[in-house]
């Protein structure tokens, strides 16, 4: 017997559906109506035939009461080829729900998204996460998707994007967006970051994550942030192959005084990079290749410093003199 495609936990909190059959019984998903967290994985299916079975242009208000009754707050949809029209239909219906967090992963969106009808209401998400989502519309995808969302989005995460740069002139400002995560876009680079950080479209950013994004130097990132007018409080540059030295011909970049937390862990650094902010609350340099202790002008003033997992601290990799101190903690790097 084939396993049930959907599983609801005992608390009716989390429901996960894996539709791997070529002709799945989508009605199985109805057992998820009581769940708060719902995950639907479509096994890479093309949902084009769905368009024939549903009226994507139907007025979603007829479903409003039913949708409002749903408990779902977090929804993940993955592994499918989805016509843009179908996605829009789903967003229009979900606009009446209490959904707060939407994750789309391993999706191929085909066709163009129609504009938001005047009478339609946007989806009031606080968090939108996209991983490996491709859009037929290329660089304008964010602007097209944005019009279907209310302006209160707080968290936006875009990983493994096929086009991490956006058509900035079409994108409206995200006035409430405090966290932007562009991690796991190894082809982004510092030039791509400048293109992705549409100037003045992200005025409220506090947390910016750029893990594994092909960044080269902290100074280059500083320049991209300055150009975009983005002033995060927290910046994560971990898991990039960073160079410690700055090109002498490159102009010196002044970090925003708002920045108080910088993560440079797992960055392959052999020395503390030049051109860091003068003062930080948190600096994470763990799991790098620092083979000697920093001298006083090589570190900014930091309240909370993490250096664990560097060769100069790991017993056996260097000969510490009598009385030298290491943390005694050797993390798995």
């Amino acid at each position: 017997t084939t396993p049930e495609p959907c599983e609801l936990d005992d608390e009716d909190f989390r429901c996960v559906c894996n539709f791997s059959e070529p002709q799945p019984d989508w009605s199985e998903a109805f057992q998820c109506v009581s769940a708060v967290e719902v995950e639907i994985h479509a096994g890479g299916l093309n949902l084009e035939p769905f368009l024939k079975r549903v009226d994507a242009d139907a007025d979603p208000r007829q479903y409003a009461d039913t949708v409002k009754a749903l408990r779902v707050r977090r929804l993940t949809v993955g592994a499918a080829q989805v016509p843009a029209q179908l996605l829009v239909g789903a967003l229009r219906v979900l606009a009446y729900s209490r959904l707060k967090e939407l994750t789309l992963e391993d999706l191929k969106i085909t066709g163009t998204m129609p504009p938001l009808p005047l009478e339609a209401t946007g989806l009031a998400l606080s968090s939108l996460r996209l991983r490996n989502v491709s859009w037929a519309t290329g660089r304008s995808w964010l602007a097209e998707l944005q019009q279907w969302l209310k302006p209160g989005l707080k968290v936006l995460s875009i990983a493994q994007a096929h086009s991490p740069a956006f058509s900035c002139e079409q994108v409206r400002a995200f006035p409430a967006l405090t966290s932007l995560d562009l991690s796991d876009n190894p082809g982004l680079g510092e030039r791509g970051l400048m293109a992705a950080l549409c100037p003045h479209k992200f005025p409220a950013i506090q947390n910016l994550a750029l893990r594994n994004t092909g960044m080269e130097t902290p100074t280059g990132v500083c320049a991209a942030l300055a150009a975009a007018g983005v002033q995060p409080h927290s910046l994560d540059l971990s898991h990039n192959s960073l160079r410690a030295t700055v090109n002498p011909s490159a102009p010196r970049c002044m970090w925003s005084s708002a920045l108080n937390s910088l993560n440079l862990s797992f960055a392959g650094l052999e020395q503390v990079p030049k051109g860091l902010p003068a003062k930080l609350r948190v600096l994470d340099l763990s799991c790098n290749r620092l083979n000697r202790a920093p001298q006083p002008d090589e570190l900014p003033e930091v309240d909370n410093l993490t250096l664990d997992g560097n060769p100069f601290l790991v017993p056996g990799t260097a000969l510490p003199h009598e009385g030298s101190m290491n943390s005694g903690v050797v993390p798995a790097c």
């Epitope: 000697r292 202790a293 001298q295 003033e301 410093l305 250096l307 009385g323 030298s324």
Partner: antibody
Amino acid sequence: QIQLVQSGPELKKPGESVKISCKASGYTFTDYAMNWVKQAPGNGLKWMGWINTQTGKPTYADDFKQRFVFSLETSASTAYLQINNLNIEDTATYFCTRSTFYYSSYIYGWYFDFWGPGTSVTVSS
Amino acid sequence: DIVMTQSPTSISISVGERVTMNCKASQNVGSNVDWYQQKTGQSPKLLIYKASNRYTGVPDRFTGSGSGTDFTFTISNMQAVDLAVYYCMQSNTNPPWTFGGGTKLELK
């Protein structure tokens, strides 16, 4: 073992210059910053500043920004303190001392773990 | 610059007694205070770093405590060999670093 050996005592006239050496052995010279500390007769210790032994960049305390020069001869694992245009108030013992980095679960800093024996400089007309 | 005020300037003490001296920073220095011992005609020696950590080879009769602006250095069982001048130094994470004026230990 780790040692800092300083040059011998100096007797100078006002207006002259003096250059004191501090030769390090027993450790990798360029891994630790070198500091200079002044002690006038009967007085306490006064931190003069330090030099980054990787880059050669000196940092001077406010009272020592004018006539004082820190330098290195890395190949000889030696740090130097030069005082120009000497005056009576420069009469003191000058110590070199290595600053060692300390780190333990988020807390860090430097302390002076090895000191040279001091070089006495007397300025008298 | 941060000013380190040490008190008292001198203490008369007998062998075997407990001796305590203080150091006050003009602003918060966290736990960034070290204590050094200087005997007549010698260079200073590190005893305590980061307010309370005893340096390698330093006898356990020497202890340090405090944080913020107030720091204390104690010799629990005074020995004749401990006669010296003791200096506190603030080693806040970025220079300039400053020493206190010193406390001289003398025999009663």
